[in-house]
Every structure is written in C-alpha cells, then in structure tokens.
C-alpha cells in the first residue's frame, strides 16, 4: 500500500532571465527512493539515480543544474519555460510517486508592475 505523499513548491513564478529551484519532498513512507526523474511535459530534464548519481539530459545541459538535494535548478529562464514540471519518485517497495509544479516565467519586474498598475 502506498502511504507516502509528495510535497512540492506548488505554483511558482520567476523572472525571465533568472533562476528557479524546483523542489519536491517525499514524506510519510519508509520506502527507499531508488531514482527521481524530472520532466517538463513529457520531456526528460534530469535523472538522479541512487546508485549512479545525476544524469542531465544533453538537450538541457546549458540551462539545468542538479540540486540542491534531489531538486533541480533551472537557469536563464525564458517565457517558453512556463508550464508544468513533474518530479517522479521511483521507490521500493511502494512504486512511483509523482509531484507537480507549475512555473510561470514573468517579464522583468518593471514590465510586470507596468501590467498590473496602470496610471490613470
């Protein structure tokens, strides 16, 4: 029986050109984490394997860094990075747990404020 739960940072926002840390945490289970996969809509970003360590997808090496911990750091963010990200925890004996994070990449704070507050 799967008793664990995944806690994530939920819905987050970051500025274009900046960085963001995607973080998930598996709790309420004694299952052993054998691997964590990070995906962006079906595209693999990275794998952290308990035995072999990190594998960063070659397609994302210029903009993805491993860690901290089992998390993932996205760098040089663009508006196209807006979307869903998934942490997929492979565990033994429980099986697979999946967490979801929604990232919104915003224009710089000046543009952001300009959109929110209009001068009468």
């Amino acid at each position: 029986m799967m008793t664990g739960t995944i806690e994530t940072t939920g819905n987050i926002s970051a500025e274009k050109g900046g960085s963001i840390i995607l973080q998930c945490h598996l709790s309420s289970t004694t299952a052993q984490v054998t691997q964590v996969n990070w995906e962006q809509q079906d595209q693999l970003l990275a794998i952290c394997n308990a035995d072999l360590g990190w594998h960063i997808s070659p397609s994302f090496k210029d903009r993805v860094a491993p860690g901290p911990g089992l998390g993932l750091t996205l760098q040089s963010l663009t508006v196209n990075d807006t979307g869903e990200y998934f942490c997929i925890y492979h565990t033994y004996p429980d099986g697979t747990y999946t967490g979801r994070i929604f990232l919104e990449v915003l224009e710089s704070s000046v543009a952001e404020h300009g959109a929110r507050f209009q001068i009468p």
Epitope: L44, L52, H90
Partner: antibody, heavy 117, light 113 residues
Framework: QVQLVQSGAEVKKPGASVKVSCKAS????????IHWVKQAPGQGLEWIGD????????NYNEKFRGRVTLTADTSTSTVYMELSSLTSEDTAVYYC??????????WGQGTTVTVSS | DIVMTQSPDSLAVSLGERATINCKSS????????????LAWFQQKPGQPPKLLIY???TRESGVPDRFSGSGSGTDFTLTISSLQAEDLAVYYC?????????FGAGTKLELK
C-alpha cells in the same frame, strides 16, 4: 560481467526494414541508456539515437528520425533498433552501447546489415 | 550539431615513441555544474567495436594502461600515448556527449613508422 550481445548479420532488399536486437546482462538494465551507432564500411562512427529502458525516453539523430525506432523490453533486458526504407547507404555495422553520464563504456559486438538487390 | 575535428588523419610513430592526437570541438563541452568536459576517446581495431579509453576528457577507464592519457578542457583536447606498443596500432576517435546529437571525430589512424 557486463555484456551486450547483438543479433546476427542481416541481408535485406532496398525498401525493406531490419530489426536488430541488443541483449544486456551483468547490470541493472533499467538504470542505463542504450545508444546505437552506425559504421559504414571503411568509415567513421555516426550516432543514431538512444533509449532509456527505465522510462519512456528516447532521442534520435535528425538524420535518422522517421526511419528508426528504438524500443526496449525490460522482461528480457533487450533493446531493439528497427530501421525502415532501407537503401544501400544503410549497409553498415550497427553497434549498441551502454551509457549513463560518463561515457559509452560497454559496446555490443556489432551487427552487419547489408542492403542489396 | 557540434563538429569534432580530429588531427592528424593518420600518424606514423615508432615503437616506444610518443603519439599525440588532437581533437577540437566547435562548441564548448565543459558543463559548469560539475566542471567536467563531456569528451571521450575510443580505440578501434579492425573487426572490433570501439573500446572506451578516456572519459570526461582526462579520466582513464578502468583497465586501460596508464600510457594512455587525455588532457584539455572546453574545446581543445589531446590524447597522448606516452610509449607506443604494437597493440596500440588502431584507429582513435574522439566523441562529444555534451549535447544531442552525440558526434564523433573522423578518426586518426595510428600506424607504425
């Protein structure tokens, strides 16, 4: 010990398809990527694509995309490369190789595919 | 695609002498997060699959004799055989595995002088 054993030589007619297998042993099959590399007679090495048996991930060289399909059968620890619409340009030795993050460290013995009418 | 340029195309060296093969990448292969260059060197003999010699530009694969060494970072790399043995006569390839598609150099044929 780690071993990658490939299927035997194939002779095919132009327009046909070929399916080459690569059976892995001696390690946890689902932990490593399997890459495929082509070597035409007297030529260098050309990367075709890779597949991760521990997930649904695969990547292809654009040159082969649409003609090559990589699949994995975890029950038999075997990866398959299917190449369709064969031409004489596909006559080559095809290798599978194991990879994680540091390099392609173990290679199969190679499978010779000859395309001839 | 990242282009790997190997030189020379062929190299004739006497037994016991040093052999040096160069490889230049059209793009940087150094990954900032781990400060490793994603470059490997392979040896291939006729009728055999390639054999991994060096990975991460300078790390010798287990079981490879210490006369083989790799150096370089970023875009310029070198494979050195300090004292050529008869069994070293082969074709040598560099390969980048930084980004898709993975690409190989055209190869350097090492022959006896």
């Amino acid at each position: 010990q780690v071993q990658l054993v490939q299927s035997g030589a194939e002779v095919k007619k132009p327009g046909a398809s070929v399916k080459v297998s690569c059976k892995a042993s001696g390690y946890t099959f689902t932990n490593y990527w399997i890459h495929w590399v082509k070597q035409a007679p007297g030529q260098g090495l050309e990367w075709i694509g890779d597949i991760y048996p521990g997930g649904r991930y695969s990547n292809y060289n654009e040159k082969f995309r649409g003609r090559v399909t990589l699949t994995a059968d975890t029950s038999t620890s075997t990866v398959y490369m299917e190449l369709s619409s064969l031409t004489s340009e596909d006559t080559a030795v095809y290798y599978c190789a194991r990879y994680y993050e540091s390099a392609m460290d173990f290679w199969g013995q190679g499978t010779t595919v000859t395309v001839s009418s | 695609d990242i282009v790997m340029t190997q030189s020379p195309d062929s190299l004739a060296v006497s037994l016991g002498e040093r052999a040096t093969i160069n490889c230049k990448s059209s793009q940087n292969l150094l990954y900032n997060s781990n400060q490793k260059s994603y470059l490997a060197w392979f040896q291939q003999k006729p009728g055999q699959p390639p054999k991994l010699l060096i990975y991460w530009a300078s790390t010798r694969e287990s079981g490879v004799p210490d006369r083989f060494s790799g150096s370089g970072s970023g875009t310029d790399f070198t494979l050195t055989i300090s004292s050529l043995q008869a069994e070293d006569l082969a074709v040598y390839y560099c390969q980048q595995y930084y980004n898709y598609p993975f690409t190989f150099g055209a190869g350097t044929k090492l022959e006896l002088k």
